[in-house]
């Protein structure tokens, strides 16, 4: 057992251009508070997944009012540490989410309004009992500086808080076979109560004779690394040689979740879904009351007047979760038109439009021809977000800038010869044919299939096609 401790040093504008606007104003004074969520392992979990190692809320910071014209400074912070108690072994690797919340203190109906200012997340390795680790994380234009550590609660010691220490029975030395408890040299390591042979690095026990494994280890003595690469089933140890997992007792057998929590298996362990008012790996931590303000996003807290009675958050429309911390997926209704990408920013939906479309919901088909000229007398034709040019005779290409070869399609019939001309093409017809494309045969008596030849042109003369 032990406590994860988080100390926030500063929250304010990060370096570089684009300093954020102050979150508070003379009209809307506000104060900050923080929430930390811890999960075991290095998993890339969604922000909404359970805080299996525990969670904590800070106190509210001092009320802050922006000074007109002044840049946003580092904002005043709550006093004290955020502490997340853990009952079991410290996992050594963990994921964290730290949220900065703003509580507006204006004259809102129904009490203060909360909004999420920034959320940072990371994955770290940390041994219990070590020094404070310092960190800087950026969220947009904001920067959060903080330190954290994990410390064991007596009598536990060690990097995972799994070894137990007891005060010395004699002032000078420990009992037979027992070592001093570094760094607490005035204490002695307690007699081993775990199952004989239980791995001191990867196993621990809470009851005499048991051997429980840390994440990533299995086997009766926690000496077998978990490897699912060549295994068929996700449960239980198979042999000490392969470390494969084959069907065995499931992690949810006997329901390890306390206080009415429901257990679900994960690939390596289990996960408890806790009822309102409880959290922690096994739903063992309680004590949050409505006075702690556990309901986010304007949720209304009911009950929970004392630590023994669970609170319930009544969420406003669009929010859900036991603390109203989860937003309903409004983008699933697909409000963006014309293939636009939907983004739920919380305060509003935004659509990122495809080329050729604009408007809050990508509803406007842009004039594809606006500002786009077709050269050499071509005309612009709109269509589907991309313009094209209908070119004048003798020109081609995307913008009608290329000279077309009018003879490329062999337009002159019956062996007529084609000549390119500045205004089009000219066909020189073979004997016996006439017409713009040499398409008409000349009759033997000198008459043609045409009613009459145009004045000034004799059959066989080149015909210019305009």
């Amino acid at each position: 057992a032990g406590v994860f401790e988080l100390q926030i040093h500063s929250f304010g504008p990060g370096p570089g251009p684009g300093a954020p606007r102050s979150p508070c104003s003379a009209r809307l004074p506000c104060r900050l508070f923080f929430r930390v969520c811890l999960k075991p392992g290095l998993s890339e979990e969604a922000a909404e997944s359970p805080c299996a190692l525990g969670a904590a809320l800070s106190a509210r910071g001092p009320v802050y009012t922006e000074q007109p014209g002044a840049p946003a400074p580092d904002l005043p912070l709550p006093d004290g540490l955020l502490q997340v108690p853990f009952r079991d072994a410290w996992p050594g690797t963990f994921s964290f989410i730290i949220e900065t919340w703003r509580e507006e203190l204006g004259d809102q109906i129904g009490g203060p309004a909360w909004s999420l200012l920034a959320r940072v997340a990371g994955r770290r390795r940390l041994a219990a009992g070590g020094p404070w680790a310092r960190d800087i994380q950026r969220a947009g234009a904001w920067e959060l500086r903080f330190s954290y550590r994990a410390r064991c609660e007596p009598p536990a010691v060690g990097t995972a808080c799994t070894r137990l220490c007891r005060p010395r029975s004699a002032p000078s030395r420990c009992g037979p076979g027992l070592r001093p408890c570094a760094p607490l040299e005035d204490e002695c390591e307690a007699p081993l109560v775990c199952r004989a042979g239980c791995s001191p690095e990867h196993g621990f026990c809470e009851q005499p004779g048991e051997c429980r494994c840390l994440e990533g280890w299995t086997g009766p003595l926690c000496t077998v690394p978990v490897s699912t690469s060549s295994c068929l089933s996700p449960r239980g140890p198979s042999s000490a040689t392969t470390g494969c997992l084959v069907p065995g007792p499931g992690p949810c057998d006997g329901n390890p979740c306390a206080n009415g929590g429901s257990c679900s298996e994960t690939p390596r362990s289990f996960e408890c879904t806790c009822p309102r008012g409880f959290y922690g790996l096994r739903c063992e931590v309680s004590g949050v009351t409505c006075a702690d303000g556990p309901c986010f996003n304007g949720g209304l807290c009911v009950g929970g007047a004392d630590p023994d009675s669970a609170y319930i958050c009544h969420c406003p429309p669009g929010f859900q979760g036991s603390n109203c911390e989860k937003r309903v997926d409004r983008c699933s209704l697909q409000p963006c038109r014309n293939g636009g990408l939907c983004l739920d920013l919380g305060h509003a939906l935004r659509c990122r439009c495809r080329a050729g479309f604009a408007g809050p919901r990508c509803e406007h088909d842009l004039d594809d021809c606006a500002g786009r000229a077709c050269a050499n007398g071509g005309t612009c034709v709109e269509g589907g977000g991309a313009h094209r040019c209908s070119c004048a005779l003798g020109f081609g290409g995307r913008d009608c800038r290329e000279r077309a070869d009018p003879c490329a399609a062999r337009p002159c019939a019956h062996g007529g010869r084609c000549y390119a001309h500045f205004s089009g093409l000219v066909c020189a017809c073979a004997p016996g044919y006439m017409g713009a494309r040499c398409e008409f045969p000349v009759h033997p008596d000198g008459a043609s299939a045409l009613p009459a030849a145009p004045p000034g042109l004799r059959p066989g003369d080149p015909q210019r096609y305009l």
Epitope: P317, L333, Q334, P335, R337, P360, R361
Partner: nanobody, 120 residues
């Protein structure tokens, strides 16, 4: 500014039918997208059926062939006809609408919720 008023719902035996309706009123210029979400006990809210911004119809896989969404544009109303109901359809059903207001802004609105309970 805009109200979504739901009606229908209630208690029904498995295999039975129910019809939900949702009427939008207020400073509405146009309704861009409108549909139905549901939230089963202890679970996330999920889209059941809706008319998207492009006007197409979208259904959750679990209700395809059983639920039908329809609308009356003149009344700014959307309906959800639920047939062959199953116990797992038990949830609070919420109407949702993405509305273009008279000032040309777009806002997303929720109805008050309607309980649907399907007995085995």
């Amino acid at each position: 500014q805009v109200q979504l008023v739901q009606s229908g719902g209630g208690l029904v035996q498995a295999g039975g039918s129910l019809r939900l309706s949702c009427a939008a009123s207020g400073s509405i210029f146009s309704i861009n997208a409108m549909g139905w979400y549901r939230q089963p006990p202890g679970k996330q809210r999920e889209l059941v059926a809706g008319f998207t911004g492009d006007g197409s119809t979208k259904y959750a896989d679990s209700v395809k062939g059983r639920f039908t969404i329809s609308r009356d544009n003149a009344k700014n109303t959307v309906y959800l006809q639920m047939n062959s109901l199953k116990p797992e359809d038990t949830a609070v059903y919420y109407c949702a609408a993405d509305v273009q207001l008279l000032n040309s802004d777009y806002e997303f609105y929720w109805g008050q919720g309607t309980q649907v309970t399907v007995k085995p």
